[in-house]
């Protein structure tokens, strides 16, 4: 049988190393060797492959090495499969070398800023040594933030008559680290050179970017102030190196700017103590350029009605993201403040928010949120300066088992009839949303029986037992885990029951 | 259409020297390698020189090698054969023909040369 | 260096096929690609076939070439002779050692 015909032949061209040719198949049922027919200088030479016999059979790829590679050219390649049966020949294929050609990366020796010149970095860098003298290269420059994994890209040419290679990129943030990497490739060519070795440059620093504000209300004290929890927080979008000196806040009553009052702090968060009418806050970060926008929140007074618009809400959680959606009968509102913070029985060691525009979502990785806690997350609506009330909701990123089954005892012990009642596993071990109770009973040497009762019971009356027996007993807690048992209590029910035993006395 | 006219062709004595030119149109002539390819009275096909894109490289058969000079204009379309020290068995058409991909595609008329 | 030898001549009656062949002095003929030319009395060569098998579009599918690396030689194959076929045929090849083309010695084609 012949060999198949020679097909997909796909070459390259690295620049003063090699040309080398690959095509299909790549291996062939029998012994099949092969010869590559070029020419070239425009087609007035021609050749072979100079690949030898050891490595030639059953090998898809030959390559031409210098002298004889010379460019600017055009070649032909024909690929020729021998077997003991006879030749194939591929179709001739036509190559421009500078559509393949093949350069090394270039290297960036420094990407500084450039003084007084904001958001911008400099990026300067040598020249492939192995690239064509007289040719017009092309460049992609990638680009990212230290911390991020997106890289952005910019695409530029340079002229052979521009020996400065350099690259002013511009539109960045400010006092931020950027990862740069740079390819090149000749201007026609449809290769590109692998990507430069990495190198880090960081932007100037300025005035802080801004604030992200907000506060938790507090119920008022005795003496009728109220305590304000104030906490802000880089703006989203602000430089992560951005780093203030610290922060100015001031607040007065409304229409009542006489009675401002000031603070200066280098803490992320600050209790105020206003009275009862509408105040307004402010806040600004400073650092040695300067001060960033002033963030605004508005308190409303003690007795001010707030807006409620948000009718439902669900969580739900994806392979790796908790998401919180909601809907709303205020079309008009968007903007929404979102709380969330561990569900414990003390006082919340964590607590976190932010701002979500144009959207009636939010979304966290599931990472962020520990697995096994419950948190509690509260939507607040934001129209201007006004806050409506929240709407809650509580949500696990992952359930377990609970750590610890119910405390159980046993009440009003009869002679057919026991009333079991249990302790609510403390929030701290529940590990998940409690689904149901599941209490096990079995007479001493007898049969276990079950009942699965709500989330909501707490004490459940078994009857239908039997007179004078030992029963050991146990309720399980579950969760969509699995559930946990509870300590094994034991009873034992009565010959005869207290009310009649009563009665036969009195006679 | 494609056309290469050849001139400059005569009678010349043995010793002398003549240029022949080749005019080329209807194609970018400095993308092609060109060549002269001479053919004696009743005789085959001959190749005697060629010349590459640019000009920087020039290629003889050995029995012109010294004696005859390819050389090209871009800007003008032309091709050159500067023959020196003629010899009788110089006596030939004299073509002037485009190098293709992979083999002479077009050719002049030819002009005669007689060295005697 | 190589030469290409070709018969002085060659004939065929008037629809026949006849074959010339162009034999390398040495080195393999398969590694330099052969071409074929046809020129009429009095007239400039023109290419019949090119990379030892390959017709350009405008020439008559009667003609067709080979290379036989066992005799390492070309052939040029032409079908349902014509008179018009009546002509001189050079075979061609690259010679590396020479840096330069070589024509092998013409065949007279005569239709009877």
């Known amino acids: 049988v012949l060999p198949a015909k020679p097909e997909n032949i796909s070459c390259i061209f690295y620049y003063e190393e090699n040309f080398t040719c690959t095509w299909s198949p790549e291996k062939e049922a029998s012994y099949t060797w092969y010869k590559v027919k070029r020419t070239y200088s425009y087609g007035y030479k021609s050749d072979i492959c100079s690949t030898d016999n050891s490595t030639r059979g059953n090998h898809a790829s030959c390559s031409f090495l210098p002298p004889t590679i010379t460019n600017p050219d055009n070649y032909t390649i024909q690929v020729e499969a021998q077997n003991a049966d006879g030749i194939m020949k591929s179709d001739i294929t036509y190559w421009n070398l500078d559509a393949i050609m093949k350069i090394e990366p270039p290297e960036i020796f420094s990407v500084k800023s450039v003084l007084g010149i904001k958001r911008m970095l400099q990026i300067k860098w040598i020249r492939p040594v192995l690239a064509p003298h007289s040719s017009t290269l092309k460049y992609t420059l990638r680009f990212r933030t230290i911390n991020s994994a997106y890289w952005m890209e910019v695409n530029f040419t340079k002229e052979d008559i521009d020996r400065d290679e350099t690259y002013n990129l511009t539109e960045l943030q400010a006092f931020t680290e950027y990862v740069m990497t740079l390819r090149c490739a000749p201007a026609e060519s449809m290769f590109w050179s692998g990507w430069s070795q990495e190198k880090v440059g960081t932007t100037e620093e300025e005035a802080p970017y801004g604030l992200d504000l907000w506060r938790v209300l507090k119920p008022a004290m005795v003496d009728g102030r109220r305590p304000v929890q104030l906490m802000w927080k880089k703006a989203t979008g602000a430089p992560v190196l951005e780093k203030a000196l610290g922060y100015n806040i001031w607040y007065f009553p409304e229409n009542n700017t006489n009675l401002t009052e000031t603070v200066n702090t280098t803490n992320q968060t600050h209790e105020l103590y206003l009275g009862g009418k509408t105040y307004w806050v402010y806040v600004v970060s400073y650092n040695s350029l300067g001060e960033s926008p002033v963030a605004t929140l508005r308190i409303p007074a003690l007795n001010e009605k707030t807006f409620q618009c948000i009718e439902a809400m669900q969580a739900c959680l994806t392979q790796d993201q908790l998401v919180v959606e909601w809907q709303s009968s205020a079309p008009e509102v968007d903007t929404w403040m979102v709380e969330w913070f561990p569900d414990v029985d003390s006082e919340p060691s964590s607590f976190s928010w932010e701002s979500v525009s144009q959207a009636r979502n939010w979304t966290i990785q599931k990472d962020e949120l520990k697995p096994l806690w419950c948190y509690n997350i509260s939507v607040y609506p934001v129209l201007r300066d006004r806050v409506g009330q929240p709407y809650s909701t509580q949500a696990y990123v992952q359930e377990g088992i609970p750590s610890a089954g119910p405390v159980t005892q046993a009440d009003s012990i009869g002679v057919k009839t026991v009333t079991i009642t249990w302790k609510e596993i403390p929030k701290s071990k529940r590990n998940g949303f409690i689904k149901n109770y599941t209490i096990f009973y079995q007479a001493e040497d007898g049969k276990e029986f079950s009942k699965t009762v709500n989330s909501n019971i707490l004490q459940y009356r078994l009857e239908s037992l039997t007179r004078r027996t030992s029963y050991s007993l146990q309720v399980m807690a579950s969760t969509n885990a699995g559930g946990t048992n509870g300590t094994k209590i034991n009873f034992k029910t009565l010959s005869i029951s207290h009310h009649h035993h009563h009665h036969h006395h009195h006679h | 259409e494609v056309q290469l006219v050849e001139s400059g062709g005569g009678l010349v004595q043995p010793g002398r020297s003549m240029k022949l030119s080749c005019v080329a149109s209807?194609?970018?002539?400095?993308?092609?390698?060109m060549a002269w390819v001479r053919q004696a009275p009743t005789k085959g096909l001959e190749w005697v020189a060629s010349?590459?894109?640019?000009?920087?490289?020039?290629y003889y058969r050995d029995s012109v090698k010294g004696r005859f000079t390819i050389s090209r204009d871009n800007a003008k379309s032309t091709l050159y054969l500067q023959m020196d020290s003629l010899r009788s068995e110089d006596t030939a058409t004299y073509y002037c023909?485009?190098?293709?991909?992979?083999?002479?595609?077009?050719w002049g008329q030819g002009v005669m040369v007689t060295v005697s | 260096q190589f030469t290409l030898t070709q018969p002085k001549s060659v004939s065929g009656s008037l629809r026949s096929t006849i074959t010339i062949p162009c034999e390398r002095s040495?080195?393999?003929?398969?590694?330099?690609?052969v071409s074929w030319y046809q020129q009429h009395l009095g007239r400039p060569p023109i290419n019949v076939i090119y990379?030892?098998?390959?017709?350009p579009s405008e020439v008559s599918d009667r003609f067709s070439g080979s290379i036989d690396s066992s005799s390492n030689s070309a052939s040029l194959t032409i079908t349902n002779l014509q008179m018009d076929d009546e002509a001189d045929y050079f075979c061609?090849?690259?010679?590396?050692?020479?840096?330069?083309?070589?024509f092998g010695g013409g065949t007279k084609l005569t239709v009877l």
């Open positions: 023909a485009r190098h293709g991909t992979l083999y002479f595609d077009y």
């Open positions: 209807g194609f970018t002539f400095s993308n092609y390698y």
């Open positions: 010349i590459s894109t640019g000009g920087g490289n020039t």
């Open positions: 061609q090849s690259y010679d590396s050692n020479i840096d330069g083309p070589v």
């Open positions: 040495s080195g393999d003929i398969g590694n330099t690609y």
């Open positions: 990379a030892d098998d390959q017709r």
